[in-house]
Interface confidence: low
Amino acid sequence: VPRWRQQWSGPGTTKRFPETVLARCVKYTEIHPEMRHVDCQSVWDAFKGAFISKHPCNITEEDYQPLMKLGTQTVPCNKILLWSRIKDLAHQFTQVQRDMFTLEDTLLGYLADDLTWCGEFNTSKINYQSCPDWRKDCSNNPVSVFWKTVSRRFAEAACDVVHVMLNGSRSKIFDKNSTFGSVEVHNLQPEKVQTLEAWVIHGGREDSRDLCQDPTIKELESIISKRNIQFSCKNIYRPDKFLQCVKNPEDSSCTSEIHHHHHH
């Protein structure tokens, strides 16, 4: 039934979205001298052009290509950290281990992190009321397509040993439907990537199980091995201790903090 205004199932565009994107861009380019010459007004124009006046269930990766081009960035391909359902710890880690990068440590990931956005077909309005939900409405919405696009490119750029942080507290430690499971795993390049090393983060303080033996980790190992990439897995039993040891690696109590379980 045609409606005057489409009501979607998900939250609307983040308030002050244009100002936030522009301000984040300016901040990022100031903090990262190698990106200082990115023109943030052009970046915002390209971002806006990807979804404004377009039906929010009919967005394609092509819509984001002008933004991808403007946001082209070289990160060390052997210093990439992927994550799934454990973003905060991954970001805490790269804040300490400054030579490693999550997607949100790149310009485009930083711009969009935690934001929601969508437009309306045939109007230049941003929809602050509601945006499509991936499950209940449609998968080809502006936010989902953005993350699929940048995640694919990020995974394609990776080389040597790629690390992924996984949440050991979840029923599916590796989830085929996550961005990592559905996009990044399948876009690692076997000719460049030698090993995927999973870090399984434990939640409970008394949890001493070897979560590298979890069936979903075995499933991940199988997918990766079929792609001619080696797989390795480590339990991070105490994430707080792990972060402390990253900060102070010379601490004598840190030698056994990461427990190795290698699979090839």
């Epitope: 522009l22 301000a23 861009c25 100031e30 903090i31 010459h37 023109d39 943030c40 007004q41």
Partner: antibody, heavy 120, light 111 residues
């Protein structure tokens, strides 16, 4: 209305020091990078220094490195330029300028300038 | 450092006539497909005022008789029909590399 008002200029002997201030109003100071630019009498413009919004990135032209220090106090909406070991060639009108919001290095608003004269 | 050379150093143009100022960079100021060249106007006793940013974008509030063009190393500022209030010194500036540098200026007068 955006306003930048410089102060602190004056006559100083070679080897002396001065601290310039730039009071900002009419905009959210903490959202903008800021610069100092100078202009010697009858000469062209010369960029001196830049400071980012949170002071995490600071850049200088080589000839003032080690002698000049740019800083800011976002709570006071004020930009500073501490100048030491002053030389005759530092004589100029000193302008503070607001970095254009969407790209590093060019300036959409300037103060009226404050004059620094280095002479014995 | 990128050296910007403006020509001519001074220019006398009749009211209503076209004024053209050139700026040549010692190396390309293009990056990410954008030319990081900007133009300012400075009237006597006043601070500079931004006219054109990124080679060809007119700053808001600037009259449409001002226009900019060029890429890489060669840039032009054009005043299509000179008005009395346009008497000033005009500077080009590059922001592609630190240190940020300005041209030596072009003084525009009325003939």
């Amino acid at each position: 209305e955006v306003q930048l008002v410089e102060s602190g200029g004056g006559l100083v002997q070679p080897g002396g020091s001065l601290r310039l201030s730039c009071a900002a109003s009419g905009f959210t100071f903490s959202d903008y990078g800021m610069h100092w630019v100078r202009q010697a009498p009858g000469k062209g413009l010369e960029w001196i220094a830049f400071i980012s919004t949170g002071s995490s990135n600071i850049y200088y032209v080589d000839k003032v490195k080690g002698r000049f220090t740019i800083s800011r106090d976002n709570a006071k909406n004020t930009l500073y330029l501490q100048m030491t070991s002053l030389r005759a060639e530092d004589t100029a009108v000193y302008y503070c300028a607001r970095n254009y919001v969407s790209s590093y290095g060019y300036f959409d608003y300037w103060g009226q300038g404050t004059t620094v004269t280095v002479s014995s | 450092d990128i050296v910007l050379t403006q020509s001519p150093a001074s220019l006398a143009v009749s009211l209503g006539e076209r004024a053209t100022i050139n700026c040549r960079a010692s190396e390309s100021v293009d990056n990410y497909g954008i030319s990081f060249m900007h133009w300012y106007q400075q009237k006597p006793g006043q601070p500079p005022k931004l006219l054109i940013y990124r080679a060809s974008n007119l700053e808001s509030g600037v009259p449409a008789r001002f226009s900019g063009s060029g890429s890489r190393t060669d840039f032009t500022l054009t005043i299509s029909s000179l008005q009395a209030e346009d008497v000033a010194v005009y500077y080009c500036q590059q922001t592609n590399k630190d240190p940020l540098t300005f041209g030596g200026g072009t003084k525009v007068e009325i003939k």
